[in-house]
Interface confidence: low
């Protein structure tokens, strides 16, 4: 069964996905797709990384964490009801049938009738660079709590402690993590 995440129309949705690279900078390709993970690859790819970089992304879909350290959590900006559904995070570990697949269910709720508080407006504006604040490198940025050392086949539910209080209430508090190597 998929882990469920919620967001309101007009907000940014956050879908957590992590792995621990065997060594810093020793990256594993990852794809994000709309729809449940198929046998191979991702269907309806919205974002893809390779061994170096994010090499494909589409409008409104971003990685905001330090993907070089394995934070490949997806942000979808300014969601609409049409963004509801299953999303696949596929960590493409070398070797036959070694991929780790995570299906995450996104539920979009209609926006509240009452005006959004200023904090929400700040959140939407700040979020695209939350973990990659210009002028601070990956080693210095505000970042998620350190990932536990777990085996490849283990999946851990993490409480993603975000130091920026403006963001904390807007993000879901669980995600999938694997360790490679």
């Amino acid at each position: 069964s998929e882990v469920e995440y919620r967001a309101e129309v007009g907000q940014n949705a956050y879908l957590p996905c992590f792995y621990t690279p065997a060594a810093p900078g020793n990256l594993v390709p990852v794809c994000w797709g709309k729809g449940a993970c198929p046998v191979f690859e991702c269907g309806n790819v919205v974002l893809r990384t390779d061994e170096r970089d994010v090499n494909y992304w589409t409008s409104r879909y971003w990685l905001n964490g330090d993907f070089r350290k394995g934070d490949v959590s997806l942000t979808i900006e300014n969601v609409t009801l049409a963004d509801s559904g299953i999303y696949c995070c596929r960590i493409q570990i070398p070797g036959i049938m070694n991929d780790e697949k995570f299906n995450l269910k996104l539920v979009i709720k209609p926006a509240k009738v009452t005006p959004a508080p200023t904090r929400q407006r700040d959140f939407t504006a700040a979020f695209p660079r939350m973990l990659t604040t210009r002028g601070h490198g990956p080693a210095e940025t505000q970042t998620l709590g350190s990932l536990p050392d777990i085996n490849l086949t283990q999946i851990s539910t993490l409480a993603n402690e975000l130091r920026d209080s403006r963001l904390a209430n807007d993000l879901r508090d669980s995600g999938a993590t694997i360790r490679i190597g």
């Epitope: 990256l27 170096r52 971003w62 210009r134 490198g137």
Partner: antibody, heavy 121, light 107 residues
Framework: EVQLVESGGGLVQPGGSLRLSCAAS????????IHWVRQAPGKGLEWVAD????????DYADSVKGRFTISADTSKNTAYLQMNSLRAEDTAVYYC??????????????WGQGTLVTVSS | DIQMTQSPSSLSASVGDRVTITCRAS??????VAWYQQKPGKAPKLLIY???FLYSGVPSRFSGSRSGTDFTLTISSLQPEDFATYYC?????????FGQGTKVEIK
């Protein structure tokens, strides 16, 4: 304070070589991409090459591919641009600049003061 | 390579004027566009990153926007220190490419 300081420029004959250095302070180059960007006299900016020091990944502009080599020594927190088979059209001020490895955010937030390379006989 | 076509190549304006510089990408670059200011004999300085984010320490009179593959740098009220050359840059793909520059001169 973040600083980038280039050195190694000068006058060289066509076909000659130069090695430029970019000494970084105030941050660890292992966490960033380091780029070289050049500007011919009275002209605009042209990206030359970049390196991601911790992964050793490099990219080059077609105009310098096979002639220039970018490298980095993380222990010295310094990036280098080895320029061989220099041509008159390589004459420019060469800047090193700091970028982020994620292409989506890879604007250059800190630049060195530049070093002039003149290729002339 | 992605071409960044910047216009105008130069403009004359007075202190207090609203100035707009545009850059058109030859293909989709998402929001991966930055704007820089350069003064004679100096290195460029980052003003705007990711199309519309104001870089730290840059005055709020500078702003950036995107409409498809068209990107705009606006200076809401030109100040004496703003007379310089401005460049756009796409960083969506390698190689990163710059516009040819816009020189903002005193009228």
């Amino acid at each position: 304070e973040v600083q980038l300081v280039e050195s190694g420029g000068g006058l060289v004959q066509p076909g000659g070589s130069l090695r430029l250095s970019c000494a970084a302070s105030g941050f660890n180059i292992s966490n960033y991409a380091i780029h070289w960007v050049r500007q011919a006299p009275g002209k605009g900016l042209e990206w030359v090459a970049d390196i991601t020091p911790d992964g050793g990944y490099t990219d080059y502009a077609d105009s310098v591919k096979g002639r220039f080599t970018i490298s980095a020594d993380t222990s010295k927190n310094t990036a280098y641009l080895q320029m061989n088979s220099l041509r008159a059209e390589d004459t420019a001020v060469y800047y090193c600049a700091r970028g982020y490895v994620y292409r989506m955010w890879d604007s250059f937030d800190y630049w060195g003061q530049g070093t002039l390379v003149t290729v002339s006989s | 390579d992605i071409q960044m076509t910047q216009s105008p190549s130069s403009l004359s304006a007075s202190v207090g004027d609203r100035v707009t510089i545009t850059c058109r990408a030859s293909q989709d670059v998402n929001t991966a566009v930055a704007w820089y200011q350069q003064k004679p004999g100096k290195a460029p300085k980052l003003l705007i990153y990711s199309a519309s984010f104001l870089y730290s320490g840059v005055p709020s009179r500078f702003s950036g926007s995107r409409s498809g593959t068209d990107f705009t740098l606006t200076i809401s009220s030109l100040q004496p220190e703003d007379f310089a050359t401005y460049y756009c840059q796409q960083h969506y793909t390698t190689p990163p490419t710059f516009g040819q520059g816009t020189k903002v001169e005193i009228k």
